[in-house]
């Protein structure tokens, strides 16, 4: 049976999967696939690690935790309804039929539609869907995607809004640039 996880369209989905390395650096291969875990391997592989590194991945799929520590949780970026379905996390432990298999059901809900704000007081309201959840689990630290173009009249307001905000750090860390003009 699979365990169900939920995300909204436009958000990042988080599918947790872990194992305990036998010893530090003694990693085992892991694969993530779309569809329930088959008898061997993963079907429709979206990401794979070996004993040293992530050796295969497709766009929008990445490991946010440190896989060298056994955190092989999958993040799917900017999900759509088409991302719904069952995902397989397979810990490929050496030996016959030793693999650990986890079937995770991802349910994507339509994005909540919020009315346009009358005053653009905060950054998320001013630039909807610019913030995506990135990190370990739901309601995690938020990082910025690409910044929209911002004209001169918005600059000072935006700067004031950001000054005491944690978003200021995220802006800096994201390497986003503000274009004037």
């Amino acid at each position: 049976s699979e365990v169900e996880y939920r995300a909204e369209v436009g958000q990042n989905a988080y599918l947790p999967c872990f194992y305990t390395p036998a010893a530090p650096g003694n990693l085992v291969p892991v694969c993530w696939g779309k569809g329930a875990c088959p008898v061997f391997e993963c079907g429709n592989v979206v990401l794979r690690t070996d004993e040293r590194d992530v050796n295969y991945w497709t766009s929008r799929y990445w490991l946010n935790g440190d896989f060298r520590k056994g955190d092989v949780s999958l993040t799917i970026e900017n999900v759509t309804l088409a991302d719904s379905g069952i995902y397989c996390c397979r810990i490929q432990i050496p030996g016959i039929m030793n693999d650990e298999k986890f079937n995770l059901k991802l349910v994507i809900k339509p994005a909540k539609v919020t009315p346009a704000p009358t005053r653009q007081r905060d950054f998320t309201a001013a630039f909807p869907r610019m913030l995506t959840t990135r990190g370990h689990g739901p309601a995690e630290t938020q990082t910025l995607g690409s910044l929209p173009d911002i004209n001169l009249t918005q600059i000072s307001t935006l700067a004031n809004e950001l000054r005491d905000s944690r978003l200021a750090n995220d802006l800096r860390d994201s390497g986003a640039t503000i274009r004037i003009g």
Epitope: F18, T20, D66, P138
Partner: antibody
Framework: EVQLQQSGAELVKPGASVKLSCTAS????????MHWVHQRTEKGLEWIGR????????KYAPKFQGKATITADTSSNTAYLQLSSLTSEDTAVYYC??????????WGQGTTLTVSS | DIQMNQSPSSLSASLGDTITITCHAS??????LSWYQQKPGNIPKLLIY???NLHTGVPSRFSGSGSGTGFTLNISSLQPEDIATYYC?????????FGGGTKLEIK
């Protein structure tokens, strides 16, 4: 043998800051997440946050954001917890713990922090 | 945040009894749950990880089960040394959270 040795008891005044240490032996902290958990007298366990000593990245419980700062020094195999603007509410036992990766398999002996004027 | 609702908060049982402690997660945590024992004046000690795996050196009288949102810790043939407070913990998502604890006393 894996051990986590924490610094000794602290008695500090309200408004002050304190830095607690947790020195690991028997393993390299770079290979594990290091966490801090606190426990008030006769109360339950509460997770403060963690650090990945390999890259210095941290996670905090919302309640401790701005109050706690977790750092690590891999050369001395030590994790630190700094607590600022202390009040009597911060009086508690503070534990460091190693996770592997989603459960705590080893704990320090605890550091008692007393905030009193 | 994922809330961990642990019950009962206290429990009194006789030596030799079998007792059950339950933990309910506010959202699915699959099997990423562990149980800890804290004896009076001592540090917490890992009993069970991944919902049902017994940690090295823990007596087989302890067992865990569950998946998704509902979990149980069973202690069979209760011994005097089992007097302690027991905590569940979810390690799936940050911020990590613990149950409120169950204080076990012997009648």
């Amino acid at each position: 043998e894996v051990q986590l040795q924490q610094s000794g008891a602290e008695l500090v005044k309200p408004g002050a800051s304190v830095k607690l240490s947790c020195t690991a032996s028997g393993f390299n902290i770079k290979d594990f997440y290091m966490h801090w958990v606190h426990q008030r007298t006769e109360k339950g366990l509460e997770w403060i946050g963690r650090i990945d000593p390999e890259d210095g990245k941290t996670k905090y419980a919302p309640k401790f954001q701005g109050k706690a700062t977790i750092t690590a020094d891999t050369s001395s195999n030590t994790a630190y917890l700094q607590l600022s603007s202390l009040t009597s509410e911060d009086t508690a036992v503070y534990y460091c713990a190693r996770s592997n990766p989603y459960f705590f398999d080893y704990w320090g002996q605890g550091t008692t922090l007393t905030v009193s004027s | 945040d994922i809330q961990m609702n642990q019950s009962p908060s206290s429990l009194s049982a006789s030596l030799g009894d079998t007792i059950t402690i339950t933990c309910h997660a506010s959202q699915t945590i699959n099997v990423w749950l562990s149980w800890y024992q804290q004896k009076p004046g001592n540090i917490p000690k890992l009993l069970i990880y991944k919902a049902s795996n017994l940690h090295t050196g823990v007596p087989s009288r302890f067992s865990g089960s569950g998946s998704g949102t509902g979990f149980t810790l069973n202690i069979s043939s209760l011994q005097p040394e089992d007097i302690a407070t027991y905590y569940c913990h979810q390690g799936q998502s940050y911020p990590y959270t613990f149950g409120g604890g169950t204080k076990l006393e012997i009648k």
